[in-house]
């Protein structure tokens, strides 16, 4: 093939190769940018800056070479249009650092910055840990820090994330009250900080306050969707970022729902119960308390993280005639209580021409006088059982 | 033990240059960062630049660029910095100090030169 | 360049005096060092990333800071503590120094 003539030359079936003198002060308008998969540039004096700008379009990009040029400054953000970058070698160049926030979001198996006049402070303590763990082939390259010495004996004991706290109400928070919240950023090099609210939805109205390193955020005329909802406060510095994420808890009445049962393995009478603080459940069987036993049993399902319904079955191992009545759940917080009641029935009873079915073992009427809340057994009302062979 | 040792004062005219030495005892001249720093009288301390005898890279402060050129000599151990166009302004006293890596500071300093520019 | 200012720039105190310099950098920097100097000689390193002591320096002295401002405590001060102390960082090119505080005997 005929020698290229132009600053950047094809090299296979997605490359560009830029090697002529000082060609180049910038990556914009790269020819075949959008099917690129491999860029080398070397030589390039003139070539100072990487920003957001130069690598738009370059999206297929996996392999990036800038060497033995004048790169000074690379943004922390120049690689976000270049999420499939996997290598990236920038090696003799001018570089004194080079941001966290650049390598970010990227998964580089190969990171190459030999033969750059480094300056070792907080700002590449994310360096020096790839060092330590032994990424992007990072410890083969002995990093040094030009008038110090290695990257390796930099001292990082102050080389810290900023800390937060996150002040919450103690008090209880009711359905369309106003909550404060503050967050108090420490640490040094503070850069930026904010809260993350994307789960609040319609939960409250949102109002910010304050800047670093106090930061206000008031939650006007809050609903009980606020509950389980992750509020984050983050900042960052040079050497990283640090997010921290609190709930606040409405306050709301109990409620609960019951569903027609389904047979599946067991029996499962279906419920869904509300209400925060988390309320206390209680079964009743045709009007008395139902104590559970291995046979007839509460289960709740896996909670979902961001909300406070949970749902959940009451079980039933196999249960026949005995069984068959009128269920009510009963759910009660210290804002209300709340009961709901369906008819079961699991079996036909086979002895209908015996009006007086024995009462089933587990159950004991309420006893109106009881103040502990919990099922009173009575010694003189214990039931007899009756067993029948069939065939 | 670790000593850097400068060579004696000079006493040099406007536009003239200097070249000051410091030879380095005790230890790898090699492996250490060699820095100079300048002290005007009666004023505070100002960095110059400093050298990697390993490789003779530099780094200058930018006030310095252009006049002042930073050497070395592996065979005796010896760092120079050459300070051209002189001025009256340049009158201090001229440091060497190593960058002690392993604990991150200039440890070890010399004991000064004085140069006095004068017409 | 980050610049660095030191307080005071001169101050009297007698043997056995608790004496605070402080040094404020014009951005928040990642450690400091402190050098004493005695007239004629050269900076002696005191204090280096921030609060560990030099080779040989008395505990008498200590250092504290974070982010921009930074602190140099004699708890008792001897009559071979009267010097000029000057702070250092290194955050980022080129290491710039204070201007230097000068502890006099009243």
């Known amino acids: 093939a005929a020698p290229c003539p132009d600053a950047c030359c094809p090299h296979g079936s997605s490359g560009l190769r830029c090697t002529r003198d000082g060609a180049l002060d910038s990556l914009h308008h790269l020819p075949g940018a959008e099917n690129l998969t491999e860029l080398y540039i070397e030589n390039q004096q003139h070539l100072q800056h990487l920003e957001l700008r130069d690598l738009r379009g370059l999206g297929e990009l996996r392999n990036l070479t800038i060497v033995k040029s004048g790169l000074r400054f690379v943004a922390p953000d120049a690689f976000h249009f270049t999420p499939r970058l996997s290598r990236l070698n920038l090696s003799f160049n001018a570089l004194e650092s080079l941001s966290w926030k650049t390598v970010q979001g990227l998964s580089l198996q190969e990171l190459v910055l030999s033969g750059n006049p480094l300056h070792c402070s907080c700002a590449l303590r994310w360096l020096q840990r790839w060092e330590e763990e032994g990424l992007g082939g990072v410890p083969e390259q002995k990093l040094q820090c030009h008038g110090q010495g290695p990257l390796a004996h930099m001292p990082n004991a102050s080389c810290g994330v900023p800390t937060l706290k996150v002040q919450v109400p103690n008090a209880s928070v009711d359905v369309g009250d106003d909550v404060l919240l503050r967050c108090q950023v420490e640490g040094r090099g503070l850069e930026q900080a904010g809260w993350i609210l994307t789960e609040l939805e319609q939960s409250a109205t949102v109002m910010k306050s304050g800047g670093l390193p106090s930061l206000g955020l008031t939650l006007a005329n809050v609903t009980s969707d606020l509950n389980r909802k992750n509020v984050t406060c983050w900042a960052e510095n040079d050497v990283g970022r640090a997010e921290v994420s609190v709930q606040v808890n409405v306050s709301f009445p109990a409620s609960v729902q019951l569903h027609t049962a389904v047979e599946m393995h067991h029996w499962c009478i279906p419920f869904s119960v509300d209400g925060q603080p988390a309320p206390s459940l209680r079964w009743l069987f045709n009007g008395s308390v139902l104590n559970e036993t291995s046979f007839i049993f509460t289960e709740f399902l896996e909670p979902a993280a961001n909300e406070t319904v949970r749902h959940g079955c009451l079980r039933l191992n196999q249960p026949t005639h005995v069984n068959n009545g009128n269920y009510t759940l009963l759910a009660a917080n210290p804002f209300g209580q709340a009961s709901a009641s369906i008819m079961a029935a699991f079996m036909d009873n086979p002895f209908e021409f015996n009006p007086e079915d024995p009462i089933p073992v587990s159950f004991s009427p309420v006893d109106t006088n009881s103040t502990s809340g919990d099922p009173v057994e009575k010694k003189d009302e214990t039931p007899f059982g009756v067993s029948v062979a069939v065939g | 033990q670790v000593q850097l040792v400068q060579s004696g004062a000079e006493v040099k005219k406007p536009g003239a240059s200097v070249k000051v030495s410091c030879k380095a005892s005790?230890?790898?001249?090699?492996?250490?960062?060699m820095h100079w720093v300048r002290q005007a009288p009666g004023q505070g301390l100002e960095w110059i630049g400093t050298?990697?005898?390993?490789?003779?890279?530099?780094s200058l402060a930018q006030k310095f660029q252009g006049r002042v050129t930073l050497t070395r000599d592996t065979s005796t151990s010896t760092a120079y910095m050459e300070l051209s166009s002189l001025r009256s302004e340049d009158t201090a006293v001229y440091y060497c100090t190593r960058f002690y890596f392993e604990d991150w500071y200039f440890d070890v300093w010399g004991q000064g030169t004085t140069v006095t520019v004068s017409s | 360049d980050i610049q660095m200012t030191q307080s005071p720039s001169s101050l009297s105190a007698s043997v056995g005096d608790r004496v605070t310099i402080t040094c404020r950098a014009s951005?928040?920097?990642?450690?400091l060092y402190w050098f004493q100097q005695k007239p004629g000689k050269a900076p002696k390193p005191l204090i280096y990333y921030t609060s560990t002591l030099g080779s040989g320096v008395p505990s008498r002295f200590s250092g504290s800071g974070s982010g921009t401002d930074y602190t140099l405590t004699i708890s008792s001060l001897q009559p071979e503590d009267f010097a000029t102390y000057y702070c250092?960082?290194?955050?980022?090119?080129?290491?710039?120094f204070g201007g230097g505080t000068k502890v006099e005997i009243k």
């Open positions: 005790g230890y790898t001249f090699t492996t250490y960062w």
């Open positions: 250092q960082q290194w955050h980022s090119y080129p290491p710039t």
């Open positions: 050298i990697y005898p390993g490789n003779s890279d530099t």
């Open positions: 951005s928040s920097i990642s450690w």
